[in-house]
């Protein structure tokens, strides 16, 4: 059993069919030393009698918040929540697998630049009952400071039958170095709670690994005098980090046609524009990367050839 | 090219070969995050490889203030990729075959360290830890582990020079 | 993009020779080696060994030294597989293929096959 | 050489069934190996590379496992366009070899 914060308490109990599960031994805060009686939740039914109450937790049933009363008043309150460990694996019922980069991907995280600053984000199922709380930092052993708001809901999609939530956090680190080369990843660890069940979820990752730059912007076109073809140009996305002679991009610029089974002309380029041929009712598109590094590619920024 | 003394590198140079060797250190290894390495066993580490790190004055004010700083820093760091590319981690099992991109990374590492340091000149260099695996599955780790920290080294350095060549050459 | 035409099928007698041609297009061809394998009817695949067309150098299976010589012509981009001494057991379906860029011998692009039958 | 030891050499399964085809080397590969997947008349085609990832545009019921020498292809569920043959190979050492394959039929 360890703290979870003040009075709330997680159980850490193997989880199998006829599990002898975990003695607990919850103490009352209070000086008092008699007539002290224990009750769970709501119910008026007393548990036992003194400053110290044992308890067997096996089950949900055993979890809950535990309060000591003395004479009608209340005098401490111990939540229980239970992490449930099945055949050596902690369980992970609370948020969905995004499979994507790989399998167990719960978390998945996000950065526009080399600043510090990041977005993870996770997806549920469960509409109530939840809480997240997010911490991080840069490193393990001697770790770092990263500074992490709340977790908000920030999407609800419809995935079939299903309700699917999307929370996400923002996180920055507390002394950011964007022009040096990271050694030691930053870390994100989730507490899940719904209901009685807790659950913890963690992310691993270098932040040149999660970069995303948004999409080129005021991408333009400009026919070219008796030709089919048009240059192209754009900008580095307000977002991306400075100066970028050093922190430099690179895009891939592509003519689609109407039909997606036309064939795609791709160009690769590291300036800011570009000759194509603009076919009729195609569409040019055109999105970056880290010119040195590959990671992410942005989105589409598009315009119609018309 | 850059001395100790302090004269300047030809950047456009180092520019153009640090761009190849990005290409190169991700033809070499393309993976991303193919098997978290970070949880693979780490008896023999890469810990020692020489980081560029937020004192090594390879931002684009340190750059400014005295490029020599940081352009020792990728110096030693090419010396230490190039001994480690030329070691029996990448000559052994998992047998490489002739076309592959570690050889001509290793030949690209060692010209653009003596771009910046040409003969007669010595900057330190950092001691290369004795890494001999003997299993195919240590060698392989190591490879792996090595091609994704130079890919981030280079990736710094290539910035170095691409700052450099737009904002320092003469 | 890349491709491996493959020369057609042979039918040959025992003792004698023939020579599969493999014209690759879409990639520098002295930049990647060519691999050669084969597959006996209703048979898992053997490696036979490759040649880098950059130096000319081959390298062979044991298994196949003295009975195969892999060779390149740079000016026509095209890989040539010849087997001597033709027995019944080398009917096959002969593939060149090449391999991914990173180094390995991860086969990802194919020539159609040849198909060789030794037959009295 | 280095011996790939492939099981089962033919299956039949049924469609949305889990299948699973096991390779053994001889000795440490690490996890350099790959699996193809051959259908009738056609040529091998790249579906995993180091033991578990997953080739380009590969569907992700396709799944690899293993390291050093035991090594598994997972279909997690079956589709009748997977009838074919699979074939394991090793690419840690010359000679490179690859298993004897695994006959994949619908029931």
């Known amino acids: 059993i360890w703290e979870l914060k003040k009075d709330v308490y997680v159980v850490e109990l193997d989880w199998y069919p006829d599990a002898p599960g975990e003695m607990v031994v919850l103490t009352c805060d209070t000086p008092e030393e008699d007539g002290i009686t224990w009750t769970l939740d709501q119910s008026s039914e007393v548990l036992g009698s003194g400053k110290t109450l044992t308890i067997q937790v096996k089950e949900f049933g055993d979890a809950g918040q535990y309060t000591c009363h003395k004479g009608g008043e209340v005098l401490s309150h111990s939540l229980l929540l239970l992490h449930k460990k099945e055949d050596g694996i902690w369980s992970t019922d609370i948020l969905k697998d995004q499979k994507e980069p790989k399998n167990k991907t719960f978390l998945r995280c996000e950065a526009k630049n080399y600043s510090g600053r990041f977005t993870c984000w996770w997806l549920t199922t469960i509409s109530t009952d939840l809480t997240f709380s997010v911490k991080s930092s840069r490193g393990s052993s001697d770790p770092q400071g990263v500074t992490c708001g709340a977790a908000t809901l920030s999407a609800e999609r419809v995935r079939g039958d299903n309700k699917e939530y999307e929370y996400s956090v923002e996180c920055q680190e507390d002394s950011a170095c964007p022009a040096a080369e990271e050694s030691l990843p930053i870390e994100v660890m989730v507490d899940a709670v719904h209901k009685l069940k807790y659950e913890n979820y963690t992310s691993s990752f270098f932040i040149r690994d999660i970069i995303k730059p948004d999409p080129p912007k005021n991408l333009q076109l400009k026919p070219l005098k008796n030709s089919r073809q048009v240059e192209v140009s754009w900008e580095y996305p307000d977002t991306w980090s400075t100066p970028h002679s050093y922190f430099s991009l690179t895009f891939c610029v592509q003519v689609q046609g109407k039909s997606k089974r036309e064939k795609k002309d791709r160009v690769f380029t590291d300036k800011t524009s570009a000759t194509v041929i603009c076919r009729k009712n195609a569409s040019i598109s055109v999105r970056a990367q880290d010119r040195y590094y590959s990671s992410s590619w942005s989105e589409w920024a598009s315009v119609p050839c018309s | 090219r850059a001395v100790p003394g302090g004269s300047s590198p030809a950047w456009t140079q180092c520019q153009q070969l640090s761009q190849k060797l990005c290409t190169l250190a991700w033809s070499a290894h393309p993976l991303v995050g193919h098997m978290d390495l970070r949880e693979e066993g780490d008896e023999e580490t890469t810990n020692d490889v020489p980081h560029i790190q937020c004192g090594d004055g390879c931002d684009p004010q340190g750059l400014r203030d005295n490029s020599q700083f940081c352009l020792q820093r990728i110096h030693q760091g090419l010396i230490f990729y190039e001994k480690l590319l030329g070691s029996d981690i990448f000559t052994g099992e998992p047998s490489l075959l002739p076309d592959s991109p570690v050889g001509q990374l290793h030949a690209s590492l060692l010209g653009l360290s003596q771009l910046l340091q040409p003969e007669g000149h010595h900057w330190e260099t950092q001691q290369i830890p004795s890494l001999s695996p003997s299993q195919p599955w240590q060698r392989l780790l190591l490879r792996f582990k090595i091609l994704r920290s130079l890919q981030a080294f280079v990736a710094v350095a290539a910035r170095v020079f691409a700052h450099g060549a737009a904002t320092l050459s003469p | 993009q890349v491709q491996l035409v493959q020369s057609g099928a042979e039918v040959k007698k025992p003792g004698s020779s023939v020579k599969v041609s493999c014209k690759a297009s879409g990639y520098t061809f002295t930049d990647q080696t060519i691999h050669w394998m084969r597959q006996a009817p209703g048979q898992g695949l053997e490696w036979i060994g490759y040649i880098y067309p950059r130096d000319d150098s081959p390298k062979y299976n044991e298994n196949f030294k003295g009975k195969v010589t892999i060779t390149a012509d740079k000016s026509t981009s095209t890989a040539y597989m010849e087997l001597s001494s033709l027995r019944s057991e080398d009917t096959a379906v002969y593939y060149c293929?090449?391999?991914?860029?990173?180094?390995?011998?991860?086969?990802?692009?194919w020539g159609q096959g040849t198909l060789v039958t030794v037959s009295s | 050489d280095i011996q790939m030891t492939q099981s089962p050499s033919s299956l039949s399964a049924s469609v949305g069934d889990r299948v699973t085809i096991t390779c053994k080397a001889s000795?440490?590969?690490?996890?350099?190996v790959a699996w193809y997947q051959q259908k009738p008349g056609k040529v091998p085609k790249l579906l995993i590379y180091?033991?578990?990832t997953r080739h380009t545009g590969v569907p992700s019921r396709f799944s690899g496992s293993g390291s050093r020498t035991d090594f598994t292809l997972t279909i997690s569920s079956l589709q009748p366009e997977d009838v074919a043959d699979y074939f394991c190979h090793q690419y840690s050492s010359y000679p490179f070899t690859f298993g004897s394959g695994t006959k994949l039929e619908i029931k």
């Open positions: 180091w033991a578990s």
């Open positions: 000795r440490d590969v690490a996890i350099a």
């Open positions: 293929a090449i391999p991914d860029r990173s180094g390995y011998a991860l086969f990802i692009y």
